[in-house]
């Protein structure tokens, strides 16, 4: 049985190095992969109740606090 | 949008081996996270584990390296073998799909085993 | 691993009610600013069916009426306003840490 790198990341370690351009922060296996390795969310109809979600956050974008309603995955992860 | 059609359900005695199929459709099994996940008669919901786009699997520890998951990309089919089975593995098998946080967006209709002599 | 805990196990309530189920975890589920929570509705027979991801996102297709709340370990999944089509059994799930894991579940009967 192999345990994906989440399982020994402690839930206080520093935030993950950011991914190059065009890779992507697997949040499941917290590494950087190719973002068309992940699959994202379907677009949300028109008039549904909560923002459609974006593909990716954009590099000068941090995930915090703020950052809920980022798509993910996650190219530059800062 | 992903379909997910699972077969090789059945009745199979105590300690035998089955080995489920999940054939998907709409998106490549090379992207993204595909999982079991059983439901016992009655009971709830109960994760078995995934294989994910690089091939790597991981299972929920309770199951004891009992159960296996494979893949075949020529197919577009994950598999779940399934081997020394016990009545209490009795239950409903799905395979589903999920978003980069974990959430399952996409199931198949499930299909049952019954461990039983 | 972590345990999620729902409450009610079981309700009784009437089309047009709200309805809430809460759903404690044994220790957080956020990451990165995430709630790694999510929401299905089961009806006998069926495949479970996602209706909120990451704790207060809709799922596409979802009516509006579902709603989601909540972060750390205390969860909240509300039905404004219940519908036939709604009595089912509804299941969260945390993919915070391996093993993912469900609550019991909770089955929303009619009064």
């Known amino acids: 049985m192999r345990r994906g790198p989440r399982s020994l990341r402690g839930r206080d370690a520093p935030a993950p190095t950011p991914c190059v351009p065009a890779e992507c922060f697997d949040l499941l296996v917290r590494h950087c992969v190719a973002c068309g390795l992940l699959r994202t969310p379907r677009p949300k109809p028109a008039g549904a109740s909560s923002p459609a979600p974006r593909t990716a956050l954009q590099p000068q974008e941090s995930v915090g606090a703020g950052a809920g309603e980022a798509a993910l995955p996650l190219p530059g992860l800062l | 949008e992903v379909q997910l059609v699972e077969s090789g359900g059945g009745l199979v005695q105590p300690g035998g081996s089955l080995r489920l199929s999940c054939a998907a459709s709409g998106d490549s099994i090379t992207r993204g996270y595909w999982n079991w996940v059983r439901q016992a008669p009655g009971k709830g919901l109960e994760w078995v584990g995934y294989i994910n786009y690089s091939g790597t699997t991981y299972y929920n520890p309770s199951l004891k390296s009992r159960f296996t998951i494979s893949r075949d990309t020529s197919k577009n089919t994950f598999y779940l073998q399934m081997n020394s089975l016990r009545a209490e593995d009795t239950a409903v098998y799905y395979c589903?799909?999920?978003?980069?946080?974990?959430?399952?967006?996409?199931w198949g209709q499930g299909t049952l085993v019954t461990v039983s002599s | 691993d972590i345990q999620m805990t729902q409450s009610p196990s079981s309700l009784s309530a009437s089309v047009g009610d709200r309805v809430t189920i809460t759903c404690r975890a044994s220790e957080s589920v956020d990451d990165y600013g995430i709630s790694f929570m999510h929401w299905y509705q089961q009806k006998p027979g069926k495949a479970p069916k996602l209706l909120i991801y990451?704790?207060?996102d809709l799922e596409s297709g979802v009516p509006s009426r579902f709603s989601g709340s909540g972060s750390g370990t205390d969860f909240t999944l509300t039905i404004s306003s219940l519908q036939p089509e709604d009595f089912a059994t509804y299941y969260c799930q945390q993919t915070s840490k391996d093993p993912w894991t469900f609550g019991q579940g909770t089955k929303v009967e009619i009064k």
């Open positions: 589903a799909t999920t978003l980069p946080y974990g959430a399952m967006d996409y």
């Open positions: 990451r704790a207060s």
